[in-house]
């Protein structure tokens, strides 16, 4: 399964689309910055089996997809870029699912890293709560967009390590 290579390219495309989606300059939104507590430790561990590592990445992509699929998101971002971004994420999710099956064998159920997946879920809950508290303001979305870009770039390092392990 050649996921790390293909996913890395997909990740780069997603990052470029996210960058292009920006509506207002972050310079205007400095006061709205927020530390969402990206679960860096979940992407630092070398103890993962490849299938487990992919399942954590899958959760992050899935949560990102969900976040940008809301009606509030549709009202904020330029539709054509949002659609391209969602399509890119969807493609990555499909690739990952196929890769996990290939990695562990069709009959076996992959051992999920429950704690790591929960940490990713909680991270996105904090993001959603922030957006709600800020009433989905343009600056709040800008902060979130920048945060997702940052989390994608951090997970890219994780993927590169995964590729080196192969």
């Amino acid at each position: 399964c050649d996921l790390p290579q293909t996913h890395s390219l997909g990740n780069r495309r997603a990052l470029i689309l996210l960058a292009q989606m920006g509506r207002i300059s972050p310079f205007s939104c400095l006061k709205d910055r927020h530390d969402f507590g990206f679960p860096q430790e979940e992407f630092d561990g070398n103890q993962f089996q490849k299938a487990q590592a992919i399942s954590v990445l899958h959760e992050m992509i899935q949560q990102t997809f969900n976040l940008f699929s809301t009606k509030d998101s549709s009202a904020t971002w330029e539709q054509s870029l949002l659609e391209k971004f969602s399509t890119e994420l969807n493609q990555q999710l499909n690739d990952m699912e196929a890769c996990v099956i290939q990695e562990v064998g069709v009959e076996e159920t992959p051992l999920m890293n429950v704690d790591s997946i929960l940490a990713v879920k909680k991270y996105f809950q904090r993001i959603t709560l922030y957006l709600t508290e800020k009433k989905y303001s343009p600056c709040a979305w800008e902060v979130v967009r920048a945060e997702i870009m940052r989390s994608f770039s951090l997970s890219k390092i994780f993927q590169e390590r995964l590729r080196r392990k192969e």
Epitope: A19, G22, I24, S25, P26, L30, R33, R150, S153
Partner: antibody, heavy 121, light 107 residues
Framework: QVQLVQSGAEVKKPGSSVKVSCKAS????????ISWVRQAPGQGLEWMGG????????NYAQKFQGRVTITADESTSTAYMELSSLRSEDTAVYYC??????????????WGQGTLVTVSS | DIQMTQSPSSLSASVGDRVTITCRAS??????LNWYQQKPGKAPKLLIY???SLQSGVPSRFSGSGSGTDFTLTISSLQPEDFATYYC?????????FGQGTKVEIK
Amino acid sequence: QVQLVQSGAEVKKPGSSVKVSCKASGGTFSSYAISWVRQAPGQGLEWMGGIIPIFGTANYAQKFQGRVTITADESTSTAYMELSSLRSEDTAVYYCARHLEYAFPDKFDYWGQGTLVTVSS
Amino acid sequence: DIQMTQSPSSLSASVGDRVTITCRASQSISSYLNWYQQKPGKAPKLLIYFASSLQSGVPSRFSGSGSGTDFTLTISSLQPEDFATYYCQQSYSTPLTFGQGTKVEIK
């Protein structure tokens, strides 16, 4: 390895304009912010404004609004700062400074070597 | 605009001394404060960000503290290469503003 290389020193007449360039290498040029900071001889540091190339539009300090134009050319990974209606008080070293990639533009992580602009009749 | 005031404007110290520079903001800036070191004829260098986080590659003798309006940069044991001018900078809102600088000279 991140590097910011600025254009050379300039001597300008009062009332004229100056355009300073800053060529960046390392990282994805379009996705990080570049600010311009100036320092008059023997004085402190002063933020003039900044740009994130992917956005195109720049933010300026009120003091320089209308007199400064910050632009970026993604094809050459170069940022520019143009200051018009120059006066003697604009004599300073002008620095470009890069902010971290995929982060809010709040701290200046990398700096150019500086460009001395002298305004004299 | 947020005004940043540093004190003292200059100080004389010896190698091995503990040096403290303070920075006060005209309004609360949370922890959005950075410290820079500048040597003559050189560009500034980031030392501390977000009030107390040490920039990668900066010696551990440098430390920062504070939040709200009052901040401190401490050099625990001054080294010959630390004689320079130090600036604080707020990043709470634009325009990003700097303190007037503190020059650390050899006694």
